[in-house]
């Protein structure tokens, strides 16, 4: 907190300019009018203020706007945004995507800070849903943004926004998140032809059910092993050897290297050994010939 002192003669700021970088903290407090600062916020970012000085300028704005800054000021905060606390940001009403972009730009290249997370949360809640333009913007600045949302939050993403999602945006998503995103992606891409559809849907397949995987196996998609390994185990288990062979195409040979890992390991345990042998990969651990598998109320019994 800077103590109140009278502004020295001749030092009263007439405008926000570079001369202010030479003001001591108490002089900034005494000589810069908060209303002037608010109307000329667009100049602050171009002036090499220290963060110590920005603290003083923030204090002045806080006094002028105790209920929260108007968007006209927020849009031009620039580096002053880094001085805001999540509590400050919760008082704001940010509606313009341009304002959001301007503030995200300040933090570009750095991890998502609590301030940025709060800003995004306020913005998205204000809009009511994650529309395509917002999602485009957020994933451009933070590729992992989508996977930081809970399944409940992801449910507000309209299918049309899925077009903005790139494969790398889903890298850190867990199965629960993909369960929510996959049906949206399926809806979004439903009018595409086979090969184009697969290219788009591929990164969402960790949320696909068995019947969709069966359908894909009929389309010569040649799924790579990395995608196959991300599929839901419960969706892979009912697939036949023939279906997996069709689904993977030439990549089927990769099963051998993954035979000890889920979901391949669990799938092998469910297949007849003689069916596995038809692949010629030396996969072991299937059900011996002559054995019958009964599925009694979700419990497997071997007889």
């Amino acid at each position: 907190e800077v103590e109140k002192t009278a502004c020295p003669s001749g030092k009263k700021a007439r405008e926000i300019d570079e001369s202010l970088i030479f003001y001591k903290k108490w002089e900034l407090e005494a000589c810069v009018d908060a209303a002037l600062l608010a109307t000329q916020m667009d100049r602050v970012n171009a002036i090499p203020f220290t963060y110590e000085q920005l603290d003083v300028l923030k204090h002045k704005l806080d006094e002028l706007y105790p209920q929260g800054y108007p968007e006209s000021v927020i849009q031009h905060l620039g580096y002053l945004f880094l001085k805001m606390s999540p509590e400050d940001i919760r008082k704001w009403n940010v509606t313009s995507l341009e304002t959001l972009k301007a503030l995200l730009e300040v933090n570009k290249g750095h991890e998502m800070s609590p301030q940025v997370a709060t800003l995004i949360d306020r913005f998205v809640k204000g809009r009511g849903q994650l529309d395509k333009d917002t999602l485009d913007t957020l994933t451009a600045f933070y590729p992992g943004y989508l996977c930081s949302l809970s399944p409940e939050e992801l449910s507000s993403v309209p299918p049309s926004s899925i077009w903005a999602v790139r494969p790398q945006d889903l890298d850190t998503c867990d199965p629960r998140q993909l369960d929510v995103l996959y049906p949206k992606a399926r809806l979004a891409f439903q009018n595409m032809n086979g090969s184009e559809y697969f290219v788009k849907i591929q990164s969402f397949l960790g949320g696909a059910p068995t019947e969709d995987l069966k359908a894909l196996s009929q389309q010569n998609v040649s799924m790579d092993l990395a995608t196959f390994m991300k599929l839901r185990t419960d969706a892979v288990l009912p697939l036949t050897v023939a279906e997996v062979q069709k689904l993977l195409g030439p990549h089927v040979e990769g099963l051998k290297a993954e035979e000890r890992h889920r979901p391949v390991r669990d799938w092998i345990l469910r297949q007849r050994q003689d069916d596995l042998d038809t692949l010629g990969l030396g996969l072991q651990g299937g059900i011996p010939n002559g054995y019958l598998v009964l599925d009694l109320s979700m419990q497997e019994a071997l007889s």
Epitope: T50, Y51, E52, Y79, H110
Partner: nanobody
Framework: EVQLVESGGGLVQAGESLRLSCAVS????????MGWHRQDPGKERELVAT???????YYANFVKGRFTISRDNAKNTVYLQMNSLKPEDTGVYYC?????????WGQGTQVTVSS
Amino acid sequence: EVQLVESGGGLVQAGESLRLSCAVSGNIGSIRHMGWHRQDPGKERELVATITTVGTTYYANFVKGRFTISRDNAKNTVYLQMNSLKPEDTGVYYCRATAHPTDYWGQGTQVTVSS
């Protein structure tokens, strides 16, 4: 994190020159601008000169025409060339880097100008 180490201070006669150096290390890419500040005992630190990442320089009125701030990107060093020194230039000179999202300061180097 950004680390700053000043050197070059000392005792000189009025009218003589000194060159201060500030070696910069750490997350240099996050730096927006750098400056030299000085502090007299019992007083608030005051800005002497600033240089931005694009090389724009700013000087306090009391050193204009006498001091020059510069930088050598290859050596990650910022300099303050001080000519025509006066007794009132005496103080501890601090190097400062304003980087994302805070100000970093060196430990300071003493400059004493005797008359």
